[in-house]
């Protein structure tokens, strides 16, 4: 799985999408979960709805949101309130039984807002990150920026 | 195992300017926010600055804004802090410390180095 | 900034005896707290974070509770290695302040 880059700006709202095969998945319920270190499990963060049917209603656990559009084959969570400790690499995951498939590798980056938390010389601009020269960076920020392609460094 | 060393402290003039270096090993640096956590002598804990896994992302605490950077150099595995305008009231024992979560920014510090001494008088 | 209030600042305990240290936020940092050992000399060290989860090596006598804005740190049975001083980090914000820490002493 390739990573998909995330950016949304500190103390607002950042929205995560993850596509995925709607009949390949039907009957399936999906969450979302954090990666905590290099090696070890993916700690679930939020889950959809227990009945499959109603997965359409937002859940929330804390200030992170998951709902999933079945049809569609759309799954959304919201980070409300973004903070420095939602930076992080994330998973949505299809889950069955026992067993979960990731459906997209996920990472948060959280920009500090630039008109408050940092230097002038510390002011962010859209562009490619040396460390993922070619990784797919969405940014949902309130303007639209460009977009670039790129590999993510191999996980656990 | 997960190793941090900072160097590069000293005794420095007040307005006068210093840089701290923290090197690591044992885990993948690149992988992980990292801190600058300071404590005066005889007193508490004070976080000073966090910067990203690639360092295109920094905060600062508002006590050091505007004075000091902070920094890192992934291929050689190093976090620096340079301060500038160094006042009396930054004496401090200097720590760095991995981001404790994995590509994380603001979370719990785990492990921290064994930290460096910076006095600033006259 | 979120402030974060430690009480008590010192407590004299016995080996043996179960310690509990309170760390309060002036506002609500949900469970994005933090705790940690220092002896003197030396660098401060994880005990717990997320309020509750014990870090790995972590003797299981430590444990954590609480959300919101109250706090606890609890040692079941102090051992002579615990006389240190105990700090809490609220993580929840731009800047994670730090409470004014707890001084474990011998009584």
């Known amino acids: 799985h390739n990573t998909t880059v995330f950016q949304g700006v500190a103390g607002q709202s950042l929205q995560v999408s993850c596509p995925y095969d709607s009949m390949k998945h039907w009957g399936r319920r999906k969450a979302w979960c954090r990666q905590l270190g290099e090696k070890g499990p993916c700690q679930r963060v939020v889950s959809t709805h227990n009945l499959w049917l109603l997965s359409f209603l937002r859940r929330w656990n804390g200030s992170t949101a998951i709902t999933d559009d079945t049809l569609g084959g759309t799954l959304t969570i919201t980070l409300r309130n973004l903070q420095p400790h939602d930076a992080g690499l994330y998973q949505c995951q299809s889950l069955h039984g026992s067993e979960a498939d990731t459906l997209r590798k996920v990472l948060v980056e959280v920009l500090a807002d630039p008109l408050d938390h940092r230097d002038a010389g510390d002011l962010w601009f859209p562009g490619e990150s040396e460390s993922f020269e070619d990784a797919h960076v969405e940014h949902s920020i309130s303007r639209s920026l460009l977009e670039g392609e790129i590999p993510f460094p191999p996980t656990s | 195992q997960v190793q941090l060393v900072e160097s590069g402290g000293g005794v420095v003039q007040p307005g006068r300017s210093l840089r701290l270096s923290c090197a690591a090993s044992g885990f993948t640096f690149s992988s992980y926010g990292m801190h600058w956590v300071r404590q005066a002598p005889g007193k508490g804990l004070e976080w000073v600055a966090v910067i990203s896994y690639d360092g295109s992302n920094k905060y600062y605490a508002d006590s050091v804004k505007g004075r000091f950077t902070i920094s890192r150099d992934n291929s050689k595995n190093t976090l620096y802090l340079q301060m500038n305008s160094l006042r009396a009231e930054d004496t401090a024992v200097y720590y760095c410390?991995?981001?404790?979560?994995?590509?994380?920014?603001?979370?719990?510090?785990?492990?921290w180095g064994q930290g460096t001494l910076v006095t600033v008088s006259s | 900034d979120i402030q974060m209030t430690q009480s008590p600042s010192t407590l004299s305990a016995s080996v043996g005896d179960r310690v509990t240290i309170t760390c309060r936020a002036s506002?609500?940092?949900?469970?994005?707290l933090a705790w940690y050992q220092q002896k003197p000399g030396k660098a401060p060290k994880l005990l717990i974070y997320?309020?509750?989860s014990l870090e790995s090596g972590v003797p299981s006598r430590f444990s954590g509770s609480g959300s919101g804005t109250e706090f606890t740190l609890t040692i079941s049975s102090l051992q002579p290695d615990d006389f240190a001083t105990y700090y809490c980090q609220q993580l929840n914000s731009y800047s994670p302040t730090f409470g004014g820490g707890t001084k474990v002493e011998i009584k």
């Open positions: 506002q609500s940092i949900s469970s994005w």
């Open positions: 410390a991995k981001d404790g979560v994995y590509y994380g920014l603001g979370n719990w510090f785990d492990p």
């Open positions: 997320k309020a509750s």
